[in-house]
Amino acid sequence: KAMHVAQPAVVLANSRGTASFVCEYASPGKATEVRVTVLRQADSQVTEVCAATYMMGNELTFLDDSICTGTSSGNQVNLTIQGLRAMDTGLYICKVELMYPPPYYMGIGNGTQIYVIDPEPCPDSD
C-alpha cells in the first residue's frame, strides 16, 4: 500500500507572517520513527523549507535556526512556519517518510497554498 498524505488546500498567514496547517498521513505500518519535510514549490523550483525526524509519541525537533515548529499527535503533524513575507507565497508540500522499522514508506501531500500579505506600515501619528 502507498502512504496517503493529506493537507489543507489553502492557508492564509496571519499579520505576523505565521502560517499553520495540519499534515495527516495514513500509515500502512506501525512506524516508530518518522521524518517530516516541508518543501516549497514555486515556478517549478523546489526547495526544502525544513525537516524534522521524531520518534512516535515524542515531540518534533527542528533545527535551532529553522523557521518551522511543530507538534505530533498520532498520525497528525501540526506544522507552523514563521517569518513569512509576501515573497514567500507559494505551495508548501508536506512529505512524510516512515523511517523505521522496515519497510520504508514515503508519502507526499498535494500541497498547501500559503498566501502571505505584508502588513501595511502604520501611518505616522502627530
Epitope: K1, A2, M3, P28, E33, R35, T37, L39, V46, E48, A51, T53, K95, E97, M99, Y100, P102, P103, Y104, Y105, M106, G107, I108
Partner: antibody
Framework: QVQLVESGGGVVQPGRSLRISCAAS????????IHWVRQAPGKGLQWVAV????????YYADSVKGRFTISRDNSKNTLYLQMNSLRAEDTAVYYC???????????WGQGTMVTVSS | EIVLTQSPGTLSLSPGDRATLSCRAS???????LAWYQQKPGQAPRLLIY???SRATGIPDRFSGSGSGTDFTLTISRLEPEDFAVYYC?????????SGPGTKVDIK
C-alpha cells in the same frame, strides 16, 4: 553543478571484498537519501541499498543483505558500499543515485564496473 | 515486494512516430510514486517522469506519463533520433524499490 562520481570498481575473485565510493558535489549531501543501484551486463536495473540522511537508517535488497554494507560520511560528502563475500552474480556496473525531493532517483553517477571472476 | 512488468519488450518505430510504453504493477497503491527513466548504451539512467505524470527538470514536453492504480503509460508523442533507448519504470514509494525489465525502443 550537481553531480555524483563513483570510484573503486575493479576485478575481484569470488569470496573476496571490495569497497566502492561515490563522491557528491553541488548539493547539501546530508539532506538526501542516496542509493546504490546495479546493472549486470545486458540486464535491467536492480536496486541494491539506500542510506538516509544522517546515516542511521539503511535498507538492503535481499540479494545482498548480510554481505554488503552501505555507509556515508556527510563531512566528506561521500557514500560507500562495502561488498564482502562477492559472487559472480554481483558482477555489474554500480551506480549511486540521489533520492530527490519527491523521492524519484533524480541524479545518477556515471557508474563503476565491478567484475567478480576467478 | 511490488513487481513491475513492462510491455512490449521491444518497440520498433521510425523517427516521428508515436511511442506508447506500458508498465503494470503487481499491486495498486504506488500510483503517486512511479517514475520513468531513459537509458542509452554506456550511459547512466536519466529521470524522465516522476509521480506517474510530472516531467523532470529539462525533459522535453514530447514525453508524458499517465496512469493510476496498477497501469501506467509513458508516451513519446513524436520520436526524435535521440529518443531511441531503453526505458524503465520504477516504484519508489516503499522498500524494496523495484524496476521493470525495460522496454527497448529501436529504429525500424
Amino acid at each position: 553543478q550537481v553531480q555524483l562520481v563513483e570510484s573503486g570498481g575493479g576485478v575481484v575473485q569470488p569470496g573476496r571484498s571490495l569497497r566502492i565510493s561515490c563522491a557528491a558535489s553541488g548539493f547539501t549531501f546530508s539532506s538526501y537519501g542516496i542509493h546504490w543501484v546495479r546493472q549486470a551486463p545486458g540486464k535491467g536495473l536492480q536496486w541494491v541499498a539506500v542510506i538516509w540522511y544522517d546515516g542511521r537508517n539503511k535498507y538492503y535488497a535481499d540479494s545482498v543483505k548480510g554481505r554488503f554494507t552501505i555507509s556515508r560520511d556527510n563531512s566528506k560528502n561521500t557514500l560507500y558500499l562495502q561488498m564482502n563475500s562477492l559472487r559472480a552474480e554481483d558482477t555489474a556496473v554500480y551506480y549511486c543515485s540521489r533520492s530527490g525531493s519527491f523521492g524519484a532517483f533524480d541524479i545518477w553517477g556515471q557508474g563503476t564496473m565491478v567484475t567478480v571472476s576467478s | 515486494e511490488i513487481v513491475l512488468t513492462q510491455s512490449p519488450g521491444t518497440l520498433s518505430l521510425s523517427p516521428g512516430d508515436r511511442a506508447t510504453l506500458s508498465c503494470r504493477a503487481s499491486q495498486s497503491g504506488s500510483s503517486s510514486y512511479l517514475a520513468w527513466y531513459q537509458q542509452k548504451p554506456g550511459q547512466a539512467p536519466r529521470l524522465l517522469i516522476y509521480g506517474a505524470s510530472s516531467r523532470a527538470t529539462g525533459i522535453p514536453d514530447r514525453f508524458s506519463g499517465s496512469g493510476s492504480g496498477t497501469d501506467f503509460t509513458l508516451t513519446i508523442s513524436r520520436l526524435e533520433p535521440e529518443d531511441f533507448a531503453v526505458y524503465y519504470c520504477q516504484q519508489y514509494g516503499t522498500s524494496p524499490f523495484t524496476s521493470g525489465p525495460g522496454t527497448k525502443v529501436d529504429i525500424k
